[in-house]
Interface confidence: low
């Protein structure tokens, strides 16, 4: 399916609006520090060029690849060297090395100010004054902070963002209408970004075989009535879509995602009974809906797996003939029977099954050797089951904030070398698993919890890769994608860690503490808690609880005082001294 002009092909397929949006996202994800106006200028130039190619595909440069066209455009930015330093060296390379170079310089933690939400009236005025610019600004600000955000999905978020303003800026109480919608979009957006980051890490660090295995397991859970061949086709197409998006090929990715949605809706009967309501929606909404669709009901009377995968005398023959296909079928059959298992657990079971066949098919009596393979799965299944049970009990006992604190202490003791902001961010997110998953029925708890934890721990891995400080983190992050969570769970107190020297400045607080939002206050207290554990890694739960209770009382007292700053100045050193004594 070759086209004379790739840029004309994508422009025609996607339409001008989506084309411009995706090019803006692509540029913003590559050059994360560039001002908005610079990106808009580049996008307009690319769009005008694309239109000339639509009019005449033989026009000059229209036959160039998208990487060449986009890379050439990015390399025209005058301030590339002073803004991005060595990233400017990418421009000396030829494609495809130049694009690979740009990809390697994507920054998961860019030094950008947090987005401040203006007053509602200010936002509504900006929306009405220039809706197009307002929405482009949204795409730009999100894309530069989340350089792996799933681009076609970001267009869906932008459409919802637009709809929220269109509705709420006309409402009687604009703020009451708009703010909850913006909060929801922000939270969903962060979750979507983190989920996509794991997909990209899976593809980039562990290869497409790892991603395909994940996709087989997940799609088999979602579509248990679909045949293996159907699931395999969806997996192949989905892998192509995500490989493209993770590789910066956003136009191809969006185009292929639309094709996949079309295929799924045209073949609902052989995929899932749950697709119908998605397929009536417009494109962006349809693709989102299909991605989030609930699991279909499992077929009745599925025969036992043991017959084909344990009892059959042909197991080794079938395995030898087509290893990946046989293992893929095993994973498909196991996953469709177990919507109650996490994808990561299913992948561990497939890995264990593969290891058993590798060993047993070379043995004197292979059948005798692998006859008990399913029994070996039991401890693998029980480990996440117990973990979820224990942590949900702890969450129900403590509530979210204190549960986060328990995790902060737990993870700081495991990997105290990791930076405090990273430990706070990751532990707070790990702690959100309670509210997200523990309220669910038993059959949904493990897939919710463990697969969410995999996403959060990937964030730790991605941040740690940028500034590696702990061999233990590197080991857990790089050895096995499916065993990351068990690897982190198994880490104990780091005995080799030299405690951090006490720094009174870290525990000095001011009156500005009182004007912070509840979330910001929590982050301040949790930052102090991490620093305490880094100073005294062997402190007991009771000691730490005592210090934190004193801290909360001290802050509350000073925030109620008439002269708040004087109170902090006077009570602060007392709190520090008392804390040191309590932890001595």
């Amino acid at each position: 399916d070759t086209h004379k002009s790739e840029v004309a092909h994508r422009f025609k397929d996607l339409g001008e609006e989506h084309f411009k949006g995706l090019v803006l996202v692509a540029f913003s994800q590559y050059l994360q520090q560039c001002p908005f106006e610079e990106h808009v200028k580049l996008v307009n130039e690319v769009t005008e060029f694309a239109k000339t190619c639509v009019a005449d595909e033989s026009a000059e440069n229209c036959d160039k690849s998208l990487h060449t066209l986009f890379g050439d455009k990015l390399c025209t930015v005058a301030t590339l060297r002073e803004t991005y330093g060595e990233m400017a060296d990418c421009c000396a390379k030829q494609e495809p090395e130049r694009n690979e170079c740009f990809l390697q310089h994507k920054d998961d933690n860019p030094n950008l100010p947090p987005l401040v939400r203006p007053e509602v009236d200010v936002m509504c005025t900006a929306f009405h004054d220039n809706e197009a610019t307002f929405l482009k600004k949204y795409l730009y600000e999100v894309a530069r902070r989340h350089p792996y955000f799933y681009a076609p999905e970001l267009l869906f978020f932008a459409a919802r963002y637009k709809a929220a303003f269109a509705e709420c800026c006309q409402a009687a109480d604009k703020a009451a209408c708009l703010l909850p919608k913006l909060d929801e979009l922000r939270d969903e957006g962060k979750a979507s970004s983190a989920k996509q980051r794991l997909k990209c890490a899976s593809l980039q660090k562990f290869g497409d075989r790892a991603f395909k295995a994940w996709a087989v397991a997940r799609l088999s859970q979602k579509f248990p009535k679909a045949e293996f061949a159907e699931v395999s086709k969806l997996v192949t197409d989905l892998t192509k879509v995500h490989t493209e998006c993770c590789h910066g090929d956003l136009l191809e990715c969006a185009d292929d995602r639309a094709d996949l949605a079309k295929y799924m809706c045209e073949n609902q009967d052989s995929i899932s009974s749950k697709l119908k309501e998605c397929c009536d929606k417009p494109l962006l909404e349809k693709s989102h809906c299909l991605a989030e669709v609930e699991n279909d009901e499992m077929p009745a009377d599925l025969p036992s797996l043991a017959a084909d995968y344990v009892e059959s005398k042909d197991v080794c023959k079938n395995y030898a003939e087509a290893k990946d296909v046989f293992l893929g079928m095993f994973l498909y059959e196991y996953a469709r029977r177990h919507p109650d298992y996490s994808v990561m657990l299913l992948l561990r079971l497939a890995k264990a099954y593969e290891a058993t066949l590798e060993k047993c098919c070379a043995a004197a009596d292979p059948h005798e050797c692998y006859a008990k393979v399913f029994d070996e799965f039991q401890p693998l299944v029980e480990e996440p089951q117990n973990l979820v049970k224990q942590n949900c009990e702890l969450f129900e006992q403590l509530g979210e904030y204190k549960f986060q604190n328990a995790l902060l202490v737990r993870y700081t003791k495991k990997v105290p070398q990791v930076s405090t902001p990273t430990l706070v961010e990751v532990s707070r997110n790990l702690g959100k698993v309670g509210a997200k998953c523990c309220k669910l029925p038993e059959a949904k708890r493990m897939p919710c919890a463990e697969d969410y934890l995999s996403v959060v721990l990937n964030r730790l891995c991605v941040l740690h890769e940028k500034t590696p400080v702990s061999e233990k983190v590197t080991k857990c992050c790089t050895e096995s994608l499916v065993n990351r969570r068990p690897c982190f769970s198994a880490l104990e107190l780091d005995e080799a860690y030299v405690p951090k020297a006490f720094n009174a400045e870290t525990f000095t607080f001011h009156a500005d503490m009182c004007t912070l939002s509840e979330k910001e206050k929590q982050v301040k207290k949790q930052t102090a808690l991490v620093e305490l554990v880094k100073h005294k890694p062997k402190a007991t739960k009771e000691q730490l609880k005592g210090v934190m209770d004193n801290f909360a009382a001290f802050v509350e007292k000073c925030c109620k005082a008439d002269d708040k700053e004087a109170c902090f100045a006077e009570e602060g050193p007392k709190f520090v001294a008392a804390s040191q004594a309590a932890l001595a």
Epitope: F228, S270, P299, D308, K313, V325, M329
Partner: nanobody, 115 residues
């Protein structure tokens, strides 16, 4: 592209026989277990029989045991279902699937058992 094309269905009297065939293409037929599934009017799909990739292991639903025989010819990439002693309750669209799925991935072939 994976394709499964069934044939051999038709109208038969109770007690009669039919042999269904399923021609496969677009995938490594010899590496996959296969099944026959049927769907009677107004009912959900019902798994009928399965065979492993080599053809050594076969399994049947209780309702067809002793009457139906599943087999395969990997060289011809074809799956078969020999149906003897047919009953009116065997009336359905029969289709073949990869693995042990009960999803319709093909058009199927109509079997009607009636006097």
């Amino acid at each position: 592209e994976v394709q499964l094309v069934e044939s051999g269905g038709g109208l038969v009297q109770p007690g009669g026989s039919l042999r269904l065939s399923c021609a496969a293409s677009g995938f490594t037929f010899g590496s996959f277990g296969m099944s026959w599934v049927r769907q009677a009017p107004g009912k959900g799909p019902e798994w009928v029989s399965a065979i492993d990739s080599g053809g050594a292991d076969t399994r049947y639903a209780e309702s067809v045991k002793g009457r139906f025989t599943i087999s395969r010819d990997n060289a011809k990439k074809t799956l078969y279902l020999q149906m003897n002693s047919l009953k009116p309750e065997d009336t359905a669209v029969y289709y073949c699937t990869i693995g042990q799925s009960t999803s319709r991935g093909s058009q199927g072939t109509q079997v009607t058992v009636s006097s």
